[in-house]
């Protein structure tokens, strides 16, 4: 990790070893209000690799609801709406951080967890042409 | 939030009000080892809406490094390698949770923060606005 200069106004912490337990304020600060996020809400339908969104709910996790993308087709969609067998729809995946209640059912104790989620789909060429 | 039955083995917490401060173990549990995540590492190059990945670093944030996708073209790439301007490359965005050091520089005190990141790009049909 990166060495951070200790600020004298910081809350005290006794355990300096990993696994380290830290204090986290759950009053979420949303940085996105200052930006103008692209409205990607309808891309799932308009994409040449369209996807459906499936709700994944787990009360032991924070956030408890995560939306998972599942590509609708194995191939990509042509302008006429039919499948292009020469191209593939594939999920774009990202590792995200979530908080997992630990011990289970405890409202104020969590462990950080990395999970892999599919965010949407993109259309790719199946074969990489190697140039000699 | 969801009402969770209190487990007698839970760490004690005095503040039951929001903004609530919780204990978080930073020893990350990686759920992905049990799955076989699709190897999406080269999709950014093989997509009809290819993207570049830009490193966004912030030592006051956990994780400190986040990769941001930027679509390479406004249009999508055809089989012959040329750009089709009748289609649009657009970023697929996702809100993710990060931990922000608060107060600044404190190693053991954080606030949850939501940020919007572009994960990759997809090729969409543009919305055509018909004039009456």
């Amino acid at each position: 990790g990166i060495a951070i200069p200790r600020n004298s106004g910081c809350p005290n912490s006794e355990d300096k070893n990993f696994p380290r337990t830290v204090m986290v304020n759950l009053n979420i600060h949303n940085r996105n209000t200052s930006t103008n996020p692209k409205r990607s809400s309808d891309y799932y339908n308009r994409s040449t690799s369209p996807w459906n969104l499936h709700r994944n709910e787990d009360p032991e996790r924070y956030p408890s609801v995560i939306w998972e993308a599942k590509c609708r087709h194995l191939g990509c969609v042509k302008a006429d709406g039919n499948v292009d067998y020469h191209m593939n729809s594939v999920p774009i995946q990202q590792e995200i951080l979530v908080l997992r209640r630990e011990p289970r059912h405890c409202p104020n104790s969590f462990r950080l967890e990395k999970i892999l989620v599919s965010v949407g789909c993109t259309c790719v060429t199946p074969i990489v042409h190697h140039v000699a | 939030g969801i009402a969770i039955p209190r487990n007698s083995g839970c760490p004690n917490s005095e503040d039951k009000n929001f903004p609530r401060t919780v204990m978080v173990n930073l020893n990350i549990h990686n759920r992905n080892t049990s799955t076989n995540p699709k190897r999406s590492s080269d999709y950014y190059n093989r997509s009809t809406s290819p993207w570049n990945l830009h490193r966004n670093e912030d030592p006051e944030r956990y994780p400190s490094v986040i990769w941001e996708a930027k679509c390479r073209h406004l249009g999508c790439v055809k089989a012959d390698g040329n750009v089709d301007y009748h289609m649009n490359s657009v970023p697929i965005q996702q809100e993710i949770l990060v931990l922000r050091r608060e107060p600044r520089h404190c190693p053991n005190s954080f606030r949850l923060e939501k940020i919007l990141v572009s994960v990759g790009c997809t090729c969409v049909t543009p919305i055509v606005h018909h004039v009456a």
């Epitope: 087709h73 194995l74 191939g75 042509k78 006429d80 709406g81 039919n82 499948v83 292009d84 067998y85 020469h86 593939n88 594939v90 199946p126 074969i127 990489v128 | 076989n36 699709k38 190897r39």
Partner: antibody, heavy 120, light 107 residues
Framework: EVQLVESGGGVVQPGRSLRLSCAAS????????MSWVRQAPGKGLELVAI????????FYPDSVKGRFTISRDNSKNTLYLQMNSLRAEDTAVYYC?????????????WGQGTLVTVSS | DIQMTQSPSSLSASVGDRVTITCRAS??????LAWYQQKPGKAPNLLVS???SLESGVPSRFSGSGSGKDYTLTISSLQPEDFATYYC?????????FGGGTKVEIK
């Protein structure tokens, strides 16, 4: 019960034509991708043609491209394979097969097959 | 075209044995792999799709695994009705191609 029944096979001379049919029942034919797959005597499986649910997309491997045509009549729940300029190496059992999705990628139901023999 | 190489081409085993059949693609097929069972004079029967998803009605003694170029079909405890020829098929890149088959015979 899903059923696929092929017909139209037989003995034909090289250079001649043959048309295979596959009658489908027990499922909504118009929503599934279909394919023809062949198997030469004592050999493995080879893809011959793919068609999507509405006939708007097709694919042929190089071995049959320009000679074979896959088509479907959703009103008759029937899949076809028109085979022209037949060669000895086209001798095989021809199966029609259904994809569990719209398009024709892998196959969850197969017919019993019809034997095509190309011989002079 | 993507070449699918199955091994072994044939094997002899006894009822109750654990049997493993492998399929290697000439390039990464991103888990787009199906396994079929074929008995003499019959059409193939789909066992597994997506490299690991067992079709409904297929006994749980069958399982698929693997990623990238290398995939495996495992029969945990061979039964008399499992003696047949097994084929893998990739559906990542057209034309979809099949392995040469593995014949499982009674020892």
């Amino acid at each position: 019960e899903v059923q696929l029944v092929e017909s139209g096979g037989g003995v034909v001379q090289p250079g001649r034509s043959l048309r295979l049919s596959c009658a489908a029942s027990g499922f909504t034919f118009s929503t599934y991708g279909m394919s023809w797959v062949r198997q030469a005597p004592g050999k493995g499986l080879e893809l011959v043609a793919i068609i999507n649910h509405n006939g708007g997309s097709t694919f042929y491997p190089d071995s049959v491209k320009g000679r074979f045509t896959i088509s479907r009549d959703n009103s008759k729940n029937t899949l076809y394979l028109q085979m022209n300029s037949l060669r000895a190496e086209d001798t095989a059992v021809y199966y029609c097969a259904r994809d569990p999705r719209h398009d024709g990628y892998f196959f969850d139901y197969w017919g019993q097959g019809t034997l095509v023999t190309v011989s002079s | 075209d993507i070449q699918m190489t199955q091994s072994p081409s044939s094997l002899s085993a006894s009822v109750g044995d654990r049997v493993t059949i492998t399929c290697r693609a000439s390039e990464d097929i991103y888990d787009r792999l199906a396994w079929y069972q074929q008995k003499p004079g019959k059409a193939p029967n789909l066992l597994v799709s997506g490299a690991t998803s067992l079709e409904s009605g297929v006994p749980s003694r069958f399982s698929g695994s693997g990623s990238g170029k290398d995939y495996t079909l495992t029969i945990s405890s061979l039964q008399p009705e499992d003696f047949a020829t097994y084929y893998c098929q990739q559906y990542w890149s057209v034309p979809w191609t099949f392995g040469g088959g593995t014949k499982v015979e009674i020892k």
